[in-house]
């Protein structure tokens, strides 16, 4: 997992979430998206 | 509610083998994706293999990934973690979870957890 600093204070934690791609409509086993601060972004 | 009972568990040899086994009753089995965890003593949960509502598909965390099999049998309501070439880092408590759809499959995040089994690997 990456973690950076911002200037603000806060720090964002970076981190690979694996999904089932069965689950949201394919096929191809698991799949990873990324996530930052809370937030699935791909 | 998904109530979640665990079995298998033991003392092991290093090389050795365990089948854990993983009972489930209460709502309708296939709906969730399972996934069973590893706690380490004086660690944090980890996942270590789940597998899709199907049974189609499946993921391992590196570390057991040639090792370790999960399957599932939505007729019995089980699911069974398969673990070959054990070794003295796979030591600690194993719990089954369930998780529903389209939830991340590789945080400890899930929604039913069994109480754990112990499996310790020692010569």
């Known amino acids: 997992d990456a973690e950076f600093r911002h200037d603000s204070g806060y720090e964002v934690h970076h981190q690979k979430l694996v999904f089932f791609a069965e689950d949201v409509g394919s096929n191809k086993g698991a799949i990873i998206g990324l996530m930052v601060g809370g937030v699935v972004i791909a | 509610e998904v109530q979640l009972v665990e079995s298998g568990g033991g003392l092991v040899q290093p090389g050795g083998s365990l089948r854990l086994s993983c009972a489930a009753s209460g709502r309708t089995f296939s709906d969730y994706n399972m996934g069973w965890f590893h706690q380490a003593p004086g660690k944090e949960r980890e996942i270590v293999a789940a597998?899709?509502?199907?049974?189609?598909?499946?993921y391992y965390t590196v570390s057991v990934e040639g090792r370790f099999t999960i399957s599932r049998d939505n007729a019995k309501n089980t699911v069974d973690l398969e673990m070959n070439s054990l070794k003295p880092e796979d030591t600690g408590i194993y719990y089954c979870?369930?998780?529903?759809?389209?939830?991340?499959?590789?945080?400890?995040?899930?929604?039913?957890w069994g109480q754990g089994t112990q499996v310790t690997v020692s010569s």
């Open positions: 979870a369930a998780n529903s759809a389209g939830r991340a499959i590789n945080l400890p995040l899930y929604k039913y």
């Open positions: 597998i899709s509502r199907s049974g189609r598909s499946t």
